[in-house]
């Protein structure tokens, strides 16, 4: 058993049928010695008396808010949560496996630049009685500071018969140098509590590996005289690290017909302009990627050919 | 410890091409190592990230773009002195700091070159003959060093009398390639910045 926060405790259980569970001793936080009784949740049934209460925690019915009283007055509370270990592996019932970039990915994180700011998000089908708490650090043995905000519900979507909820959090490394070469990964730890179930999820990454630039901005077309060709131009996104000559991007320019089946013409360039043939009803899209370290491509920025 | 903006004319920077070749070569070599050594811990998640140049050179700090010198987190006070006569500098007005930056890069390349050559000698003794260092990568390191053209004491190749542990050597190769790829990215960024300045 360990303390998650004041008066909230997590009991770790080896979870299998007929498991013996864990013996837990609760102590009433009071100078009083006699006349103390114990109850669980809203029940008025007295579970025991005395300054300590010994219970055998086996299942969720044994978890909850234990309260000690004296003469009708509440003295203190202890909330017991359960953390299930199933055949040596901690349960992952609360969050959905996003399966990207690989199986068992519960937390996904992205950064728009090298400033040390990043966003993580996760999915669940649970809509109520759900709380999250996020901590982060650079490295684990001698951790350096990363500050995270509160997790918020960022999207809701319908998937088949189920509703899916997306939560996200923003974090900022306390003293980040955009040009630094990372040798210790960022660690992100999410505590999830659903009713009386506790779970924790972790992700470990280097900022360089989760970079995904914003799409190029100010995408414009300039027709070339007496030609079907156009000059496409764009700019680095505002959120990208500066100076741009040091944090350079490379670009992919795509001409896409109305029909998805039509052949796509693609050009790769390090410049912020390109000359392409603009077909009728086609659109031109441009996306960006770090020129020197191949992390994710940005989303496409698009303009119609007409 | 920053790079001045008024430096060589655009396109007059012969090291840019070599640094791009270097990044391409080390990236290909790392990919090959990850595929060949699939049963070894060779992915970024599995290896320890060690920097053999730590406390010996200070490339990131010495090559910091002027715009980042206002960022206190970037100003680690690790001073290292270097020789200052490089031929990548197409202008005579090169500041001391830029020479310091380029000589720091040169020292990095020299250290990695020695490590890779020592390692290759061990890998050639492996009866499994599973993996060797790409000669193209070693050649590209050499070309960039020549383009930088710093006079520096030659570091003797390390020779080991004991029987090599091939498993450990292959893991060390992965660690070295990961670190060298990160340094090659920094070198490419620096050369691109200097070329644009």
């Amino acid at each position: 058993i360990w303390e998650l926060k004041k008066d909230v405790y997590v009991v770790e259980l080896d979870w299998y049928p007929d498991a013996p569970g864990e013996m837990v001793v609760l102590t009433c936080d009071t100078p009083e010695e006699d006349g103390i009784t114990w109850t669980l949740d809203q029940s008025s049934e007295v579970l025991g008396s005395g300054k300590t209460l010994t219970i055998q925690v086996k299942e969720f019915g044994d978890a909850g808010q234990y309260t000690c009283h004296k003469g009708g007055e509440v003295l203190s509370h202890s909330l017991l949560l359960l953390h299930k270990k199933e055949d040596g592996i901690w349960s992952t019932d609360i969050l959905k496996d996003q399966k990207e970039p690989k199986n068992k990915t519960f937390l996904r994180c992205e950064a728009k630049n090298y400033s040390g700011r990043f966003t993580c998000w996760w999915l669940t089908t649970i809509s109520t009685d759900l709380t999250f708490s996020v901590k982060s650090s650079r490295g684990s043995s001698d951790p350096q500071g990363v500050t995270c905000g509160a997790a918020t519900l960022s999207a809701e979507r319908v998937r088949g018969d189920n509703k899916e909820y997306e939560y996200s959090v923003e974090c900022q490394e306390d003293s980040a140098c955009p040009a630094a070469e990372e040798s210790l990964p960022i660690e992100v730890m999410v505590d999830a509590v659903h009713k009386l179930k506790y779970e924790n999820y972790t992700s470990s990454f280097f900022i360089r590996d989760i970079i995904k630039p914003d799409p190029p901005k100010n995408l414009q077309l300039k027709p070339l005289k007496n030609s079907r060709q156009v000059e496409v131009s764009w700019e680095y996104p505002d959120t990208w690290s500066t100076p741009h000559s040091y944090f350079s991007l490379t670009f992919c320019v795509q001409v896409q017909g109305k029909s998805k089946r039509e052949k796509k013409d693609r050009v790769f360039t390090d410049k912020t302009s390109a000359t392409v043939i603009c077909r009728k009803n086609a659109s031109i899209s441009v996306r960006a990627q770090d020129r020197y370290y191949s992390s994710s491509w940005s989303e496409w920025a698009s303009v119609p050919c007409s | 410890r920053n790079l001045p903006v008024a430096t060589p004319d655009p396109g007059m920077f012969p090291c840019l091409h070599h640094s791009q070749n270097l990044l391409r070569a080390v990236s290909n070599m790392l990919q090959k190592a990850r595929q060949t050594l699939e049963f070894y811990p060779c992915t970024s998640e599995e290896i320890d990230h060690e920097d053999i140049t730590k406390d010996k050179t200070s490339t990131v700090e010495a090559c910091l773009p002027l715009e980042l010198t206002k960022n206190e987190s970037c100003l680690n006070s690790r001073e290292t002195s270097f020789i200052t006569n490089g031929s990548c500098l197409a202008s005579r007005k090169t500041s001391f700091m830029m020479a310091l930056c380029l000589s720091s890069i040169y020292e990095d390349l020299k250290m990695y070159q020695v490590e890779f050559k020592t390692m290759n000698a061990k890998l050639l003794m492996d009866p499994k003959r599973q993996i060797f260092l790409d000669q193209n990568m070693l050649a590209v390191i050499d070309e960039l060093m020549q383009a930088l053209n710093f006079n520096s004491e030659t570091v003797p190749q390390k020779s080991s009398l004991e029987e090599p542990d091939f498993y450990k050597t292959k893991i060390k190769l992965c660690i070295l390639l990961h670190a060298f790829r990160i340094r090659a990215v920094t070198i490419d960024r620096v050369m691109s910045y200097l070329n644009a300045s």
């Epitope: 049928p17 498991a19 055949d87 | -």
Partner: antibody, heavy 115, light 112 residues
Framework: QVQLVESGGGVVQPGRSLRLSCAAS????????MHWVRQAPGKGLEWVAF????????YYADSVKGRFTISRDNSKNTLYLQMNSLRAEDTAVYYC????????WGQGTMVTVSS | QSVLTQPPSVSGAPGQRVTISCSGS????????VKWYQQLPGTAPKLLIY???QRPSGVPDRFSGSKSGTSASLAITGLQAEDEADYYC????????????FGTGTKVTVLA
């Protein structure tokens, strides 16, 4: 004492369907994940499928994906395996088992796919 | 196709010590715990070892398990006639959990 009893096995022609059941007693069935495991005659153990305690997630071996469906009815304390498009290579003893460090197995039910 | 490899058979005289190996990789045994099962002819598998080296109550202390790196092993000391059976190791892969990974199985023969 936990007890698992499989039923529904038998002889069936290739391409046909069969539904296996696993009745659980002596256990808070709705609290635990459940597996199906099979064993072809003279061969080793092969995992078939898994279902979470609440039925929210299901996992399948590649060899049965798209043909077999695992399900459970927690009100009836019963686990099911719906087997469609059966093949000769599905011939085996099918066991249900609880998920956990200490597991419980049923006695198995024989499925024979033969023309 | 099992990814946990066991020797097809091992044998020993009564009273002898035999060991069965179970070889995996970093993503399965290297990252997860190992179980061992005993299967007597015509019966369901019976749990012998869980969490690499723990014995459930009722399993004789002649059976012991261990794990090192990407391999595990089961040792039977003081071999007895009733130990003649098939033995399977089981683990998980970190990317496909909760799919059970079983070993190829080992037939233990007690020599007369």
């Amino acid at each position: 004492q936990v007890q698992l009893v499989e039923s529904g096995g038998g002889v069936v022609q290739p391409g046909r369907s069969l539904r296996l059941s696993c009745a659980a007693s002596g256990v808070t069935f709705s609290s635990y994940g459940m597996h199906w495991v099979r064993q072809a005659p003279g061969k080793g153990l092969e995992w078939v499928a898994f279902i979470r305690y609440d039925g929210s997630n299901k996992y399948y071996a590649d060899s049965v994906k798209g043909r077999f469906t695992i399900s459970r009815d927690n009100s009836k304390n019963t686990l099911y395996l719906q087997m469609n498009s059966l093949r000769a290579e599905d011939t085996a003893v099918y066991y249900c088992k609880t998920h956990g460090s200490h597991d419980n197995w049923g006695q198995g039910t024989m499925v024979t796919v033969s023309s | 196709q099992s990814v946990l490899t066991q020797p097809p058979s091992v044998s020993g005289a009564p009273g002898q010590r035999v060991t069965i190996s179970c070889s995996g990789s970093r993503s399965n045994i290297g990252s997860n715990t190992v179980k061992w099962y005993q299967q007597l002819p015509g019966t369901a598998p019976k749990l012998l070892i869980y969490y690499n080296d723990q014995r459930p109550s009722g399993v004789p202390d002649r059976f012991s398990g261990s794990k090192s790196g990407t391999s595990a092993s089961l040792a039977i000391t003081g071999l007895q006639a009733e130990d003649e059976a098939d033995y399977y190791c089981q683990s998980y892969d970190r990317y496909t959990h909760p799919a059970l990974l079983f070993g190829t199985g080992t037939k233990v023969t007690v020599l007369a």
